[in-house]
Interface confidence: medium
Amino acid sequence: DPVLCFTQYEESSGKCKGLLGGGVSVEDCCLNTAFAYQKRSGGLCQPCRSPRWSLWSTWAPCSVTCSEGSQLRYRRCVGWNGQCSGKVAPGTLEWQLQACEDQQCCPEMGGWSGWGPWEPCSVTCSKGTRTRRRACNHPAPKCGGHCPGQAQESEACDTQQVCPTHGAWATWGPWTPCSASCHGGPHEPKETRSRKCSAPEPSQKPPGKPCPGLAYEQRRCTGLPPCPVAGGWGPWGPVSPCPVTCGLGQTMEQRTCNHPVPQHGGPFCAGDATRTHICNTAVPCPVDGEWDSWGEWSPCIRRNMKSISCQEIPGQQSRGRTCRGRKFDGHRCAGQQQDIRHCYSIQHCPLKGSWSEWSTWGLCMPPCGPNPTRARQRLCTPLLPKYPPTVSMVEGQGEKNVTFWGRPLPRCEELQGQKLVVEEKRPCLHVPACKDPEEEEL
C-alpha cells in the first residue's frame, strides 16, 4: 500500500516532519532510515529506523479528583522492519498503571446564614438595583466544598427621579464615492461624510447637553492608483537534478510571473511559482551501527585458581555487547565491545542479613486487565564483608575499584514466617481503560 513519506521523525513528539510526498511504498521511503512514513494523513507516524520503545508519556490525570484513584501512562514501539524488546510489533502500546491521590479528602457542602439587610439603590435617578448578602458559614464547608446557590441577590429599585439625557453622535455615515477610480482626471475629487446627534438626542426636560463638534467633514481623494495590469506566468524552467545520492529526494521546476509583470497594483499570477516531484535513486542509505545493551557480567574468577568465592581475593570479570544494524557502509559503533572490572565473588556465600525497610509501593499489575494490585516488600539484605574497596593489581597502574559480584545466601531471623521476602498487596482503585490516544482503527 502507498504511504506518505517524510524526511524527518521528531522523537520528542512522535510527529512526522518535512513531507516529501505520497504514493510511494514503505520500502522505497525507508531506503533512507532517517525518513518516516504515515499510512494515512493524520495517522500514526512511524520512523524508518529499526524499532525501539518511545519515551514514557506523562502520567494521565488521576481517575478521581479526591481520595485514592489510579492513573495510566504508555510508551509505543516505533520503527520499521523488526521488533522492540519483548518481541513486540511496531505500533504496539505498553502500559503502566499506578495509584494516585490528588486530594486526601472529598469536598463537603456548607450551609447559608440568613440574608443581611438591603443596600441603598445603585443610582440617584431613574431605576437601578439594590443588593443583599449572606455568609456560607452555617455550617462552614469542608475540604474545599462550597454552599449551593448565590452569596448575594439583587432586585430592581426606583428613585422616582427623571434623569437628563445628554446628546451623543451616531456613527459617521459612509464617505461619498470619489468621482474617479484612477488618478489623472480634470478635477481634484472630494469625498464627504456626515453624522446625526441622535444616539441619543439631548432631552428637553430636564435639559441635556448637545453633541460636541461638527456634523460633517470633507477631504480630498488622494493616492488614487494608476489603472492596474494583471500579471501572467512565463514557461516552466528545467527540472532541477535529484539532490540526494540515496533514498528519495525532491526535484523542482520554477516559473516567473513576467508574462507580463503585474503593474500599478494589478493582481500577481494565480497558482504556484514552483512545483515538486519525488525522485527515487533506488539506492539504500547507509545505516550506522547501534550498540545493543551490555550482556551479563561473566563469573568473577582469578586465573589459575579454581574458586575465589567467599574469600578476600580480587578477581576479574567481563561483559560484552553487540554492534547491530550496520548496513550499506554505515558507521561502525564507537566505543569498546568489551568491559572488564575487578571483583570479589560472593556467589552462594552464606552472609548475615538484616531486614530492609518497606520498599515504595510498586506499579499496579496487570495495567490492562481486571483487578490490578500493587505490592511492596521487605527483603532480607546481605551485610557485605568489609573487604578493601580498591586494589592495585599491577605495580604503577594505580588503584582500581573492586565490585562485589554474585548472589549470596543472606540469613535473617524469620519475619511473619518468611526467611527472604515479606510482601504486602493492595488493590488499585478507580482503574481507567488502556485506550490508544491516537484511537487508530485498522
Epitope: 514501539c77 504496539t92 496487570p366 490492562c368 486487565g369 481486571p370 488502556c434 485506550k435
Partner: nanobody, 129 residues
Framework: QVQLVESGGGLVQAGGSLRLSCAAS????????MGWFRQAPGKEREFVAA????????YYADPVKGRFTISRDNAKNTVYLQMSSLKPEDTAVYYC??????????????????????WGQGTQVTVSG
C-alpha cells in the same frame, strides 16, 4: 487454561449474513482480550477483528470495516462476530483467539497473531457467488 469453541459457520449466498460465536471455558473469560482471525485455502492467516476485556475498544481490518461487528457477553463467556454483506472473498476458516491480561494494547498489537495465548479449532464459512 482456557478452551475456545467456535460455532455458527456454514454456507451462505453473497450479500447474506452469519453470526459466529466463540464459547470459552474458565471463570476468568472476562479478563481476556478476544480476537477473530481467518485463513483462506493457500493463504496466510489474517486478522479480522478484536475487542478489549471490558469492551472499551474494538478494532477491525480494512476489508471488513463497516460490514462485521465484534461484541462480547461476559456473563455468557462468549464473543460474537456478526458478519453482513458477505462476499465470496470472505470464504475461510474463522478462528477465535484469547489474550491474557498484559502490559500491551492498540490495534497494531491485537492484529498480531503472536499476541494471543489461546486458539480455537476454527469454523468454516463459505460464501457462494
Amino acid at each position: 487454561q482456557v478452551q475456545l469453541v467456535e460455532s455458527g459457520g456454514g454456507l451462505v449466498q453473497a450479500g447474506g449474513s452469519l453470526r459466529l460465536s466463540c464459547a470459552a471455558s474458565g471463570r476468568t473469560f472476562s479478563s481476556y482480550a478476544m480476537g477473530w482471525f481467518r485463513q483462506a485455502p493457500g493463504k496466510e492467516r489474517e486478522f479480522v477483528a478484536a475487542i478489549t476485556w471490558r469492551g472499551a475498544s474494538t478494532y477491525y481490518a480494512d476489508p471488513v470495516k463497516g460490514r462485521f461487528t465484534i461484541s462480547r457477553d461476559n456473563a455468557k463467556n462468549t464473543v460474537y462476530l456478526q458478519m453482513s454483506s458477505l462476499k465470496p472473498e470472505d470464504t475461510a476458516v474463522y478462528y477465535c483467539a484469547a489474550e491474557e491480561p498484559s502490559y500491551y494494547s492498540g490495534s497494531y498489537y491485537y492484529m498480531m497473531g503472536d499476541s494471543y495465548n489461546y486458539w480455537g479449532q476454527g469454523t468454516q464459512v463459505t460464501v457462494s457467488g
